[in-house]
């Protein structure tokens, strides 16, 4: 039976009809009492006092209502949940993930996890209704957990008409013996000891470091991973592991050449709620590699949206060469990551100037052959984009990747809903398309336009009359990603390039074939 529920947009928690709850008001000491009425939350301020007993974890401040028994926790930055039990910065799980309290909410199949408090899970052995739910990390959220000491975090997903458990795609903190770091590398305990310039790290117990804060003599040295060694560490919450070095007889520090453990192509996908011409409105967390590129024009004031882009490493964006035919100076370009609404700043967005951009030397502006470009983001360090739930790299494909014909893939972008629309979309959209066989990706299928080996075709193969809402890329989506699931990760297969109209039956969109440019990409990204 269909149930009316309320979703608190601020906390993403769900509530049944007539259920009430308290919530803190962000950036103030006020607390609101909310009530679920016909699918809408109705909220008003209520007086509160300090809790008589501690109920909040991780340094949360507990307040309880004056006139009834409910309580609310004001969580410090980095924590969330009813009792501040959720660690929003946990980027991976240790061991089996029994203690994992992060916010990953996608199963290995790509399905979105179900909220543990959902009434549909009431009869399941593990749900947020259990008396020991808080201890097990379960509650009013849909984050992956391992309450039953299974081999890794899991959750319930709805598939084939029923709710069943499935392992999550949450990254493991230590995959095999790979000597790499997650997040900013605060937990890195590997043995790399060279900096990005090739210099050897000084031992943390070196006499030369006397007077420095981060040495083996630091009272917290053991917890920070410092000791009688010269391995790279990040004891101060910097962007990535670093170490002290001697350069020209001068004591300084440098970031290390430790590779970042790849979390590329992992995302927290949420099912789009709204259909729109040409696709579906989407959240940036479902496409965290999507970039929006804006340009200042010599003739007009302000910036205007130019094209999509794809985050492929911390400081590099892939896009389409044809977006840069106006030969903008790099300082006239801006790249925005982590934005759902095209021109509305997102809470967690990251904005960058462009250091330089490289357009393929053999780009043909008639045929759009070699339609590929690289943009280097400007940064004071060797790190630019910081990984988060809304900003993450896509995986580049292996050189020999050959997906079967008609594989379902997806594209995303802020482009127009239809070819004749005068406006770009106000919100990020996604579209689901299938890879065409090369025999169906030829000039004769595309009004005799040139189609080269550097291009691939993809389109919506659903049947339907003239009113069918076929998914496709459109103007403004150029430079954005065509991604397909490969080995459990979203992998970049194409760059949105060109097409004949948008969403026309049996007319595929044309994409730059990324596997043909892997060496070009790597070559141009060299330090």
């Amino acid at each position: 039976s269909y149930q009316v529920i309320c979703r608190d947009e601020k906390t993403q928690m769900i509530y049944q009809q007539h259920q009430s709850w308290l919530r803190p008001v962000l950036r103030s000491n006020r607390v609101e009492y909310c009530w679920c009425n016909s699918g809408r939350a109705q909220c008003h301020s209520v007086p509160v006092k300090s809790c008589s007993e501690p109920r909040c974890f991780n340094g949360g401040t507990c307040q309880q209502a004056l006139y009834f028994s409910d309580f609310v926790c004001q969580c410090p930055e980095g924590f969330a949940g009813k009792c501040c039990e959720i660690d929003t910065r946990a980027t991976c799980y240790e061991d089996q993930g029994i203690s994992y309290r992060g916010t990953w909410s996608t199963a290995e199949s790509g399905a979105e996890c179900t909220n543990w408090n959902s009434s549909a899970l009431a009869q399941k052995p593990y749900s947020g209704r259990r008396p020991d739910a808080i201890r097990l990390g379960l509650g009013n959220h849909n984050y992956c957990r391992n309450p039953d000491r299974d081999s890794k975090p899991w959750c319930y997903v709805f598939k084939a008409g029923k709710y069943s458990s499935e392992f999550c795609s949450t990254p493991a903190c230590s995959e095999g013996n790979s000597d790499c770091y997650f997040g900013n590398g605060s937990a890195y305990r590997g043995t790399h000891s060279l900096t990005e310039s090739g210099a050897s790290c000084l031992p943390w117990n070196s006499m030369i470091l006397i007077g420095k804060v981060y040495t083996a003599q630091n009272p917290s040295a053991q917890a920070l991973g410092l000791g009688k060694h010269n391995y790279c560490r990040n004891p101060d919450g910097d962007a990535k592991p670093w170490c002290h070095v001697l350069k020209n007889r001068r004591l300084t520090w440098e970031y290390c050449d430790v590779p970042s453990c790849s979390t590329c192509g992992l995302r927290q996908y949420s099912q789009p709620q709204f259909r729109i011409k040409g696709g579906l409105f989407a959240d940036i967390a479902s496409h965290p590699w999507q970039a929006a590129i804006f340009a200042k024009h010599r003739r007009s004031p302000g910036e205007r949206f130019l094209c999509g882009g794809i985050l492929i490493s911390s400081c590099w964006i892939l896009s389409a060469a044809h977006c840069f035919q106006e030969r903008f100076p790099p300082h006239h370009l801006t790249v925005i990551l982590g934005r759902t609404y095209r021109v509305v700043p997102g809470e967690e967005e990251q904005k960058f100037e462009v250091e330089k951009y490289i357009v393929h030397k053999e780009f043909d502006d008639d045929t759009y052959d070699n339609d590929i470009a690289l943009l280097q983001l400007k940064s004071d360090s060797s790190r630019c984009a910081q990984e988060s739930s809304v900003v993450r790299t896509v995986c580049l494909p292996p050189a020999d990747l050959q997906l079967p014909d008609w594989t379902e893939c997806e594209l995303s972008g802020y482009g127009k809903h239809e070819a004749l629309s005068p406006f770009y979309s106000e919100r990020l959209k996604e579209a689901h398309v299938r890879l065409y066989p090369s025999s169906r990706c030829t000039s004769q299928h595309l009004l005799n336009r040139t189609v080269t080996d550097n291009m691939l075709c993809a389109g919506d193969t659903r049947s339907g009359g003239p009113q069918a809402n076929l998914h496709d890329a459109c103007q403004g989506d150029s430079g954005g990603p065509l991604v397909c699931l490969n080995d459990g990760r979203m992998t970049l297969v194409g760059i949105i390039s060109w097409g004949l109209g948008c969403g026309q039956k049996d007319v595929p969109g044309v994409y730059t074939k990324v596997t043909n440019y892997l060496d070009w990409i790597r070559d141009n990204m060299r330090p």
């Epitope: 790399h192 050449d257 430790v258 580049l396 292996p398 050189a399 141009n524 060299r526």
Partner: antibody, heavy 114, light 112 residues
Framework: QVQLVQSGAEVKKPGASVKVSCKAS??????INWVRQATGQGLEWMGR????????GYNQKFQGRVTMTRDTSISTAYMELSSLRSEDTAVYYC?????????WGQGTLVTVSS | DVVMTQSPLSLPVTPGEPASISCRSS???????????LDWYLQKPGQSPQLLIY???NRASGVPDRFSGSGSGTDFTLKISRVEAEDVGVYYC?????????FGGGTKVEIK
């Protein structure tokens, strides 16, 4: 610190193929390049492979005869040269490239002789 | 292909004295990403080559500061401020900007 250990010396007949391996430890995400040096001669770049994605860039001089592959599970890169001739007798080096070829293998002597 | 021409072919040196090797490329070796991938390698007798200088003027880790690199466009120089006995071997310049990457013919440095 990156360390590269190459397979041992090989003796081959003209027309045969040789496959040289290069096992990496340390940061294995850098390009692996292959460079050869005939006795008493200079260095000659043959090509490169990205151990991650497997993409390659070859010197056209060897195109069609050289194949570079990798096995990420054992952090090993391979260079196979086919249709060997006497002038392919040389020491073959693998070298790891980040900002330059900073780390080199010890070299593998390949002798082509009938 | 970019041809790298080194001079001199052979360089007899006196320990403690300076030495200089020149390298000229047949075309500009500025990469499309703006970097100039001009490196210098030293191959000591019976050993694998070792990196001395990368990207024209950057000294590799552990390389003594008596080695320095300079130049731009098509003309590049490696200087040793005071030659030591351990510096003998063949010095190669190398361009990694245009495929195929190419080495110079080498300069043999030996003690007089």
């Amino acid at each position: 610190q990156v360390q590269l250990v190459q397979s041992g010396a090989e003796v081959k007949k003209p027309g045969a193929s040789v496959k040289v391996s290069c096992k990496a430890s340390g940061n294995t995400s850098y390009w692996i390049n292959w460079v050869r040096q005939a006795t008493g001669q200079g260095l000659e770049w043959m090509g490169r492979i990205d151990p991650g994605g497997g993409s390659t860039g070859y010197n056209q001089k060897f195109q069609g005869r050289v194949t570079m592959t990798r096995d990420t599970s054992i952090s090993t890169a391979y260079m196979e040269l086919s249709s060997l001739r006497s002038e392919d007798t040389a020491v073959y080096y693998c070298a790891s490239y980040y900002y330059a070829m900073a780390y080199w293998g010890q070299g593998t002597l390949v002798t082509v002789s009938s | 292909d970019v041809v790298m021409t080194q001079s001199p072919l052979s360089l007899p040196v006196t320990p403690g004295e300076p030495a200089s090797i020149s390298c000229r490329s047949s075309q500009s070796i500025v990469h499309s990403n703006g970097n100039t991938y001009l490196d210098w390698y030293l191959q000591k007798p019976g050993q694998s080559p070792q990196l001395l200088i990368y990207k024209v003027s950057n000294r590799a880790s552990g390389v003594p500061d008596r080695f320095s690199g300079s130049g731009s466009g098509t003309d590049f120089t490696l200087k040793i401020s005071r030659v030591e006995a351990e510096d003998v071997g063949v010095y190669y310049c190398f361009q990694g900007s245009h495929v195929p990457w190419t080495f110079g013919g080498g300069t043999k440095v030996e003690i007089k």
